[in-house]
């Protein structure tokens, strides 16, 4: 696995322990919590990052209205089960044998049940809507400048292929970033939109996952873009299955 050979660190994930115990004595970095070797040339999967975090010693409307099937991560942090590739296992259970099904970004998509609950497949989240509210500025940002800067950020910092940034909407003070990536579109080596969104979310909160890099300094034409609220909506390829009781609550 690629890692900085000179001092054996992981540029893309500071929640790792790196040592020269890879093949041929090369630097190998293991994610905290799981101990799985990670590829430091790209983003680490959200599942392994969550596991590491849990182990760490925390008018013309241009804005998109989230679909009725959009999920918001209301359950917060949990210690997930990851598969050998570092993806979320479809079924997650806690220490008290309460289980639920999750999507590819680890967000619950069913009611909670017991150990008999079946989650046949990991349902892919193919559309992510990142809803941001920026702090007041002297004037509105230029939409095309804002669009270009956010696309550049996802391309350069998170290594997400530009084709997966579907749109950037702006209606001061709200910014919406749409990420879309179907199963058929995602090629080997492509960064997953769920992982990119998670890195972005942590950056926005001032909790960068990158090793040694400064925090996120977002500027549009030199003007700081400071985010004061973030909401992320997740849309799955198959709609979630919640009981009517939850839907009417």
């Amino acid at each position: 696995h690629t890692a900085a050979q000179d001092n054996c660190t992981c540029p893309t994930n500071k929640m790792t322990v790196c040592s020269p115990d890879g093949p041929g004595g090369r630097c190998q970095c293991r994610a905290l919590g799981s101990g799985m070797a990670v590829d430091c040339s790209t983003l680490t999967s959200k599942c392994l990052l969550l596991k590491a975090r849990m182990s760490a010693p925390k008018n013309a409307r241009t804005l998109v209205r989230p679909s009725e099937h959009a999920l918001v991560d209301n359950d917060g942090l949990y210690d997930p089960d990851c598969d050998p590739e570092g993806r979320f296992k479809a079924r997650q259970c806690n220490q008290t044998s309460v289980c639920w099904c999750v999507n590819s970004v680890g967000v619950r998509r069913t009611d909670k049940g017991d150990l008999s609950l079946r989650c046949d497949e990991l349902v892919r989240t193919h559309h992510i809507l990142i809803d941001l509210r920026h702090r007041p500025t002297a004037g509105a940002f230029n939409h095309s400048d804002l669009d270009a800067e956010l696309r550049r950020l996802f391309r350069e910092r998170y290594r997400l292929h530009p084709k997966f940034v579907a749109a950037v909407h702006y209606e001061q003070p709200t910014i919406q970033i749409e990420l879309r990536q179907n199963t058929s579109q995602k090629a080997a080596g492509d960064v997953d939109i769920g992982d990119a969104a998670y890195y972005f979310e942590r950056d926005i909160k001032g909790e960068s996952l990158f090793q040694g890099r400064g925090g996120l300094d977002l500027r549009v034409r030199g003007e700081p873009l400071q985010v004061e609220r973030t909401l992320i909506y997740y849309l799955d390829e198959i709609p979630p299955k919640f009981s009517m009781k939850r839907l009417t609550a």
Partner: antibody, heavy 117, light 107 residues
Framework: EVQLVQSGAEVKKPGASVKVSCKAS????????INWVRQAPGQGLEWMGN????????NYNQKFKDRVTMTRDTSTSTVYMELSSLRSEDTAVYYC??????????WGQGTLVTVSS | EIVLTQSPATLSLSPGERATLSCRAS??????ISWYQQKPGQAPRLLIE???ESISGIPARFSGSGSGTDFTLTISSLEPEDFAVYYC?????????FGGGTKVEIK
């Protein structure tokens, strides 16, 4: 030459604690994980946990999580494994091992811990 | 945790014969497997790492193969000193785990 030298045999009473040391030499102590593995009489090998001496990051097998503590002293290139609330089933040979490039390449001679009333 | 299952538990063979030991993982672990030999009263000795990479100083008659979930340790021609217990161990993820062992005994 890489060497891991462990402390001598111990006899303990149930409920007591034991602290086994493992002194490393012949390599850069802070660069490689030290693992602890135990083997009960006539049984197989059981991984207890490990410590990365460079930053003292520890990772414990859930089975021992509440009873084991691994520490290190970089000035003496020594790692310690303390096991508390001992019971008779903890009677075993405890090995420290340096994890290098894939496998546990270097092993201490083992420390027999006997728990008996 | 990843469970490693070794088979057979005991292998009775004569010197000069070929020994084939199996280790099966409960999930895909790539090539993150090592093999050890242990004799009574001694610490284990590393034979193979990364499923098939030989260790300096280990006789060439010891070889390893496999990836994913199925792994094999082969001793091409048993020498008298090879009769011992053999363990596989995974280093794919924590907790690291060992197989239950295969005892190779003289027939």
């Amino acid at each position: 030459e890489v060497q891991l030298v462990q402390s001598g045999a111990e006899v303990k009473k149930p409920g007591a604690s034991v602290k086994v040391s493992c002194k490393a030499s012949g390599y850069t102590f802070t660069s490689y994980w030290i693992n602890w593995v135990r083997q009960a009489p006539g049984q197989g090998l059981e991984w207890m946990g490990n410590i990365y001496p460079s930053n003292s990051y520890t990772n414990y097998n859930q089975k021992f999580k509440d009873r084991v503590t691994m520490t290190r002293d970089t000035s003496t290139s020594t790692v310690y494994m303390e096991l508390s609330s001992l019971r008779s089933e903890d009677t075993a040979v405890y090995y420290c091992s340096s994890y290098r490039s894939g496998g546990f390449a270097y092993w201490g001679q083992g420390t027999l811990v006997t728990v008996s009333s | 945790e990843i469970v490693l299952t070794q088979s057979p538990a005991t292998l009775s063979l004569s010197p000069g014969e070929r020994a084939t030991l199996s280790c099966r993982a409960s999930q895909n672990i790539g090539t993150s497997i090592s093999w050890y030999q242990q004799k009574p009263g001694q610490a284990p000795r590393l034979l193979i790492e990364f499923a098939s990479e030989s260790i300096s100083g280990i006789p060439a008659r010891f070889s390893g193969s496999g990836s994913g979930t199925d792994f094999t340790l082969t001793i091409s021609s048993l020498e008298p000193e090879d009769f011992a217990v053999y363990y596989c161990q995974q280093s794919n993820s924590w907790p690291f785990t060992f197989g239950g062992g295969t005892k190779v005994e003289i027939k």
